[in-house]
Interface confidence: low
């Protein structure tokens, strides 16, 4: 199936040009998306091209600037947030990145009613997190690991917590491991729907071992970065959840929410918090051995000013074949009765589907079913449930948006997106206004991305928000590669693959093959999305065939494939890449003397193991920031899939699955190993240990480090990295420079 055909005709060939590496590094062919910042059922804010903050009313068709670019520029603001009562806007400047989601910033409050910045009781700096209450203009913020509350922006702050301490106690923000592997947010506080209560997490990292690495900077002596970072089997953070009444914060102070007894009996995690009403909250907990999750619904007791979590409102989710959930345990979407909810979890056939839980999980009503998976519940209204799935035409790498009418019986299902722009758009996400009165659809491909606005009642398209016309015009004279998404059936396993082919591809010729791999549990690489990236250039200009393969352990094709890697990472992911390569060779257009593999992070681990598999298939390969031993990686992630590195659990496979154990096998391949020295995520330690093992085995290899760079290798390092990898591959494939 050719998803993105090259628009090359013989008459046009002389005016068409191939992609260049410069195009990729300059972001010449990057696309834009439009996500409305909804502020009501029919209104949204958007930052215009000239940086004005504009309010759009869909129903009146009116738009006006609520905040000028002049005001934004006056404090060098890069972000903003309107208070729900629309009286104030916070302006965010001095952005300073910390980890994946976290950053600190300076905040200014602008009063829209008088057109001036709020003076007096200004916010301290730098702030770790700040947010408005859902109603009115209360402010909660985190400063130096403590939480503060302001009833109004100009008021003095009320200090909620006092025990916050750098790298020790975190209030309202996650520590490193919770940020990266559990919450996937920079915050750990949650307002109740009307702003009466504020819930927050406290993380105690006092006993966690610290990872320390040098940050070289420009000074005479390097700095040492210290991060409490629990590696597999190490001591974990201790988490507690508190709730405070924000109307009378000093009355009884923060009240702790009790942990379910079956969870509290051993090491555990808090996984998410969902407010149901102002006086009902839902917490999700997870055992350290991550196959048991408990959802606990708690109610406020006015008489005692405490939170009560009856056992009758505890719902257990357990996996007998793997870990609980997909990448994370799914979160509930509550219905209007404020007790029943919709949630995605595995059905009896091992496919993730939407279930409706009214009293117990055992009595759950299955809402969707089939040999495909429901992926996300976007919104539940009185009469509709909107979700995404990969059901349509049985392509796991697509995403379409569906509406189920839950107001009628039996519920009817409608695909909202399947036939809108069928060739151009097969991978959607959505963003809904209050009560799903309107929604935006963002299509990511396989054609050029497009964002559109729709009526939530009729699904009618109202207008195009962004169609990337400039990009479309810029691509008119570019010889883009062809892309195919197909599947291989091997030993009762379906291996979906994406192949990126040179523009003048001829099946009778032989081409060098590059495998790009990620392959981590619950990931998906074969997706019907648009991209003009490094591998597009390698196909377009350098004439390579590039393939991406989703093997065992990858997501959205059922639990059999997903949980196949449980407790044995590094085995089947590698086998399936190798199997696919053999199948590609059989297709007849691959030069089997010129096959390479590359990957980043988990992909660097898989590419390293594939190179060291002893098959003789690969001439060369690249590992960027690879994991080399699961004992070096974060507890929350690693133990989810591998269990504990103890003798009575899974230590043997921890030891057997290292890259270092296969050092000898690198002798007959060209290996390029790359890592940033300030990688907070996959520590440089991983590559240092690979390099040491290769040296000890007297195996030659190539390496590149990026000083003071993290896991993303951003900025000028990106250009250096891709230029360096390009030279390496061209040399490997004997392609002239």
């Amino acid at each position: 199936i050719v998803l993105r055909p090259s628009r090359v005709h013989n008459s046009e060939e002389n005016t068409m040009r191939a992609l260049t590496l410069k195009d990729i590094l300059n972001g010449t062919f990057s696309y834009k998306t439009f996500f409305p910042n909804w502020i009501s059922g029919q209104e949204y804010l958007h930052q215009s091209a000239d940086n004005n903050i504009v309010l759009y009313n869909i129903e009146t068709g009116q738009s006006y600037t609520i905040l000028s670019n002049r005001t934004m520029k006056s404090v060098n603001a890069s972000n903003y947030g309107l208070s729900p009562d629309r009286q104030f806007v916070y302006l965010e400047s001095d952005y300073s990145k910390l980890w994946r989601y976290s950053y600190t910033a300076t905040y200014y409050i602008y009063d829209l009613s008088n057109g001036e910045f709020v003076r007096g009781n200004e916010l301290p700096r730098p702030i770790q997190y700040l947010c408005w209450s859902p109603v009115g203009s209360k402010l909660a913020y985190v400063y130096q690991n403590n939480i503060y509350l302001k009833q109004r922006p100009g008021d003095p702050p009320f200090q909620i917590t006092f025990n916050g301490r750098e790298n020790k106690i975190f209030n309202g923000i996650p520590d490193w491991v919770y940020e990266e592997e559990m919450l996937a947010t920079k915050y750990a506080l949650w307002w109740s729907p009307n702003g009466k209560f504020l819930a927050y997490a406290e993380f105690n990292d006092t006993d966690i071992p610290v990872i320390a690495y040098s940050y070289y900077g420009d000074e005479q002596y390097p700095r040492t970065i210290n991060i409490p970072y629990p590696k597999a089997g190490a001591k974990n953070p201790v988490v507690r959840i508190f709730i405070i009444d924000t109307t009378y914060p000093a009355y009884v102070g923060p009240q702790e929410v009790p942990v379910p007894a079956m969870i509290a009996s051993s090491d555990y995690y808090f996984s998410w918090l969902t407010w149901v009403t102002d006086e009902r909250v839902c917490l999700q907990w997870l055992k350290r051995v991550q196959n048991v999750s408990v959802l606990s619904i708690c109610d406020f007791r006015e008489d005692w000013q405490t939170w009560d979590c009856p056992k009758t409102q505890e719902h257990i989710e357990e996996s007998r074949t793997g870990w609980a959930g997909g990448f994370f345990v799914s979160t509930p979407v509550f219905s209007y009765d404020a007790i029943s909810y919709y949630k995605i979890f595995s059905d009896k056939d091992g496919y993730k589907h939407i279930h409706y839980i009214k009293d117990t999980v055992e009595n759950a009503i299955q809402i969707t079913s089939g040999k495909w998976e429901a992926i996300n519940i976007f919104r539940v209204t009185q009469d509709s449930l909107f979700y995404s799935s990969n059901e349509f035409e049985e392509y796991p790498g697509r995403r379409n948006i569906y509406r189920i009418s839950i107001g009628s019986y039996p519920p009817s299902k409608k695909c909202v997106t399947c036939h809108l722009r069928k060739e151009r758009c097969q991978y959607y996400t959505a963003s809904f206004s209050d009560y799903a009165k309107y929604y935006a659809l963002v299509c990511y491909g396989p054609g050029i991305p497009i964002s559109t606005l729709h009526d939530g009642r009729t699904d009618q398209e109202i207008k195009i928000l962004e169609e990337n016309k400039e990009l479309e015009n810029a691509l008119k004279n570019i010889q883009l590669p062809k892309e195919e998404i197909k599947k291989l059936e091997v030993d009762e396993i379906t291996l979906w693959y994406k192949m990126i082919l040179p523009p003048q591809f001829d099946r009778s010729k032989k081409y060098p093959l590059l495998i790009q791999v990620y392959g981590g549990p619950c990931s998906q690489s074969v997706r019907s999305v648009f991209a003009v990236n490094w591998i597009s250039y390698l196909a377009s200009k350098e004439g390579m065939v590039i393939a991406l393969v989703d093997g065992r352990g990858t997501a959205f094709q059922g639990d059999k494939l997903l949980y196949a890697v449980y407790r044995k990472l590094g085995v089947y992911e590698v086998e399936d890449q190798i199997t696919a390569v053999r199948k590609f060779i059989e297709m007849g257009f691959i030069d089997e003397k010129r096959i390479a593999i590359w990957g980043w992070s988990y992909g660097g681990y898989v590419s390293s193991l594939a190179l060291a598999s002893g098959t003789g298939l690969f001439k060369c390969g690249i590992a960027v920031a690879p994991v080399s031993s699961w004992e070096y990686y974060a507890s929350v992630y690693t133990e989810r899939f591998m269990g504990l590195p103890t003798k009575d659990d899974n230590l043997e496979h921890y030891k057997n699955s290292t890259v270092m154990a296969r050092a000898e096998y690198f002798r007959n391949v060209d290996y390029l190993l790359i890592h940033g020295t300030a990688d907070d995520n996959v520590h440089f330690q991983n590559s240092a240990q690979i390099a040491k093992a290769l040296v000890n085995a007297q195996v030659d290899f190539q390496a590149m480090w990026y000083s003071d760079q993290n896991h993303g290798l951003s900025g000028l390092s990106t250009n250096h990295l891709y230029t360096h990898m390009t030279h390496f591959l061209k040399q490997c494939f004997s392609l002239s420079d």
């Epitope: 502020i39 009501s40 059922g41 029919q42 209104e43 309010l55 009313n57 129903e59 009146t60 006006y64 600037t65 609520i66 309107l82 009562d85 629309r86 009286q87 829209l112 009613s113 109603v135």
Partner: nanobody, 116 residues
């Protein structure tokens, strides 16, 4: 562009009551939030009370419990019932949508004077 006409102001003794009205030239049902503002001599304009389409209200600390905002979508009118008036409530009262539009969208306002 919506035209707004405020009325109902006047001179009143401290402790007295007034009901202000704001008539809009366009339907207000699709305007998410309407609000009353006031500006005392030599002071900045401030929000007094706001009301959203779903009926949720918001009041300045100084008027909470004394003033009540309401809206009649059928009549395209927003009201402000002011009880237990104090001298410090003396100001010109304006209505507008929330957040306020550009300066030219403001009405003439209605003067409220509370004598002690």
């Amino acid at each position: 562009q919506v035209q707004l006409q405020e009325s109902g102001g006047g001179l009143v003794q401290a402790g007295g009551s007034l009901r202000l009205s704001c008539a809009a030239s366009l339907k207000i049902s699709s305007i998410n939030a309407m609000a009353w503002y006031r500006q005392a001599a030599g002071k900045q304009r401030e929000l007094v009370a706001g009301i959203a389409t779903d009926g949720r209200t918001n009041y300045a600390h100084s008027v909470k419990g004394r003033f009540t905002i309401s809206r009649d979508n059928a009549k395209n009118t927003v009201y402000l019932q002011m009880n237990s008036l104090k001298p410090e409530d003396t100001a010109v009262y304006y209505c507008n949508q929330w957040p306020p539009r550009a300066l030219d969208a403001w009405g003439q306002g209605t003067q409220v004077t509370v004598s002690s």
